[in-house]
Interface confidence: low
Amino acid sequence: GWVWNQFFVPEEMNTTSHHIGQLRSDLDNGNNSFQYKLLGAGAGSTFIIDERTGDIYAIQKLDREERSLYILRAQVIDIATGRAVEPESEFVIKVSDINDNEPKFLDEPYEAIVPEMSPEGTLVIQVTASDADDPSSGNNARLLYSLLQGQPYFSVEPTTGVIRISSKMDRELQDEYWVIIQAKDMIGQPGALSGTTSVLIKLSDVNDNKPIFKESLYRLTVSESAPTGTSIGTIMAYDNDIGENAEMDYSIEEDDSQTFDIITNHETQEGIVILKKKVDFEHQNHYGIRAKVKNHHVPEQLMKYHTEASTTFIKIQVEDVDEP
């Protein structure tokens, strides 16, 4: 019968030929009376057989990722009679893996949005690399993820590629971060190959800033002839947040005379000081009122950022008008 062991050939061998093993009949006494033949896909081009000894050689570089096994057929002929010594037999040559493929991130570019001030441990995104090497061959395709850029704000779980927040971030200081993740095969051991990907992480705004008046004192004037409803000036606060988190409402905190009102222009986020009652220079030629400003929308969990509304003082001078 036929005698052989399992045949393996390493991929990417740089030698011109590589001895794989021997295929022989147990009737062969070694006197060169038998002739071995190789048939099938790859015979003669990728593999050859020494027709006298049955030794098989790979004569070209193989790529396991292109083809991982070859099915060939062997024949052994008695040279004297021309008859088959053994029935034709099928055998397999397996291409064994080497770590010749780096991990690749197939879904890049990665982008994620996470709210600013998110607590440590918040999941941001999962990145996944794939490795074309054989997952069943040692650690050639066993990956470990690590962070090359992004400390101290982010961390990556070594085995899953899950990126989490490791330090709170303030959008008002920096609104986006580039994180670079490396995937290393061979679970990081010597000979490992690596691939990297960039993740753009954008911080979305939360209402963690209260509006603050630009000025601590405003000076306005109003003519004593001005009718009620007259706009006598504007005041303005600024809010480092954006969008609806920067929408604000102005109001009177203190006006003993109850002469003025403040309405909010929600397009410009300005406070408009309005005359509520007519003024009389001869009766009172100046007024002092206090205004305050608060955000329009403040979720309960963010109220801690909004204690003590910002206030400003408004001095209003009444202008005299000649009366008949």
Partner: antibody, heavy 121, light 107 residues
């Protein structure tokens, strides 16, 4: 269409300074690495500096390290090269070049026409 | 640093001929190699990256091959617009380095 337009070149004395700009359009500037590459008269191409998208990582050729500073302004989609302590050997056409995606991140897929820097007394 | 060596320095060929340009790296750079074309007074133009991937708009007559340390740029049938200087460049390691260039001129 991706476009890169360099400016800021000129004649400067040895030891002097210049600031080159590269105005980019047609792509998301902050998502790509950007490069400066120079070419001395009648010579080949020489890489000068690279900045990663977002500006966190910068790299320099040894010949310019400590003298040149690469930077970018994402809000203006503009790349800069601040060149100090200039030498005659810095005389060249300076091109900016956009990086690519993925594995070609630190490559150069689109180039500007260049701006000429002449260092001479 | 990785030294990139291009050969020949000058290649004199006729229209329709095949041009084969070589580029050698002083150590393996995997497939992280690009080829550029430059005409007088113009900016370089990317032809090939990843050693063999054609850039957008590059005709099929231009092809790249090789990996590790030996790379080839082939122009199968030279057209008038192909006469220029060609540079290879590795982007596997810092500093990024270019070859000295090969000038393809009309014979």
């Amino acid at each position: 269409e991706v476009q890169l337009l360099e400016s800021g070149g000129g004649l400067v004395q040895p030891g002097g300074s210049l600031r080159l700009s590269c105005a980019a359009s047609g792509f998301t500037f902050s998502s790509y690495a950007m490069n400066w590459v120079r070419q001395a008269p009648g010579k080949g191409l020489e890489w000068v500096s690279t900045i990663s998208g977002g500006g966190a990582n910068t790299y320099y050729a040894d010949s310019v390290k400590g003298r040149f500073t690469i930077s970018s302004d994402n809000s203006k989609s503009t790349l800069y090269l601040q060149m100090n302590s200039l030498r005659a050997a810095d005389t060249a056409v300076y091109h900016c070049a956009k990086g690519g995606m993925g594995g070609y991140y630190y490559g150069m897929d689109v180039w500007g026409q260049g701006t000429t820097v002449t260092v001479s007394s | 640093e990785i030294v990139m060596t291009q050969s020949p320095v000058t290649l004199s060929l006729s229209l329709g001929e095949r041009a084969t340009l070589s580029c050698r790296a002083s150590q393996s750079i995997s497939s992280n190699l690009a080829w550029f074309q430059q005409k007088p007074g113009q900016a370089p133009r990317l032809l090939i990256y990843g050693a063999f991937t054609r850039a957008t708009g590059i005709p099929a007559r231009v092809s790249g091959s090789g990996s590790g340390t030996e790379f080839t740029l082939t122009i199968s049938s030279l057209q008038s617009e192909d006469f220029a200087v060609y540079y290879c460049q590795q982007y596997n390691y810092w500093p990024l380095t270019f070859g000295g260039g090969t000038k393809v001129e009309i014979k």
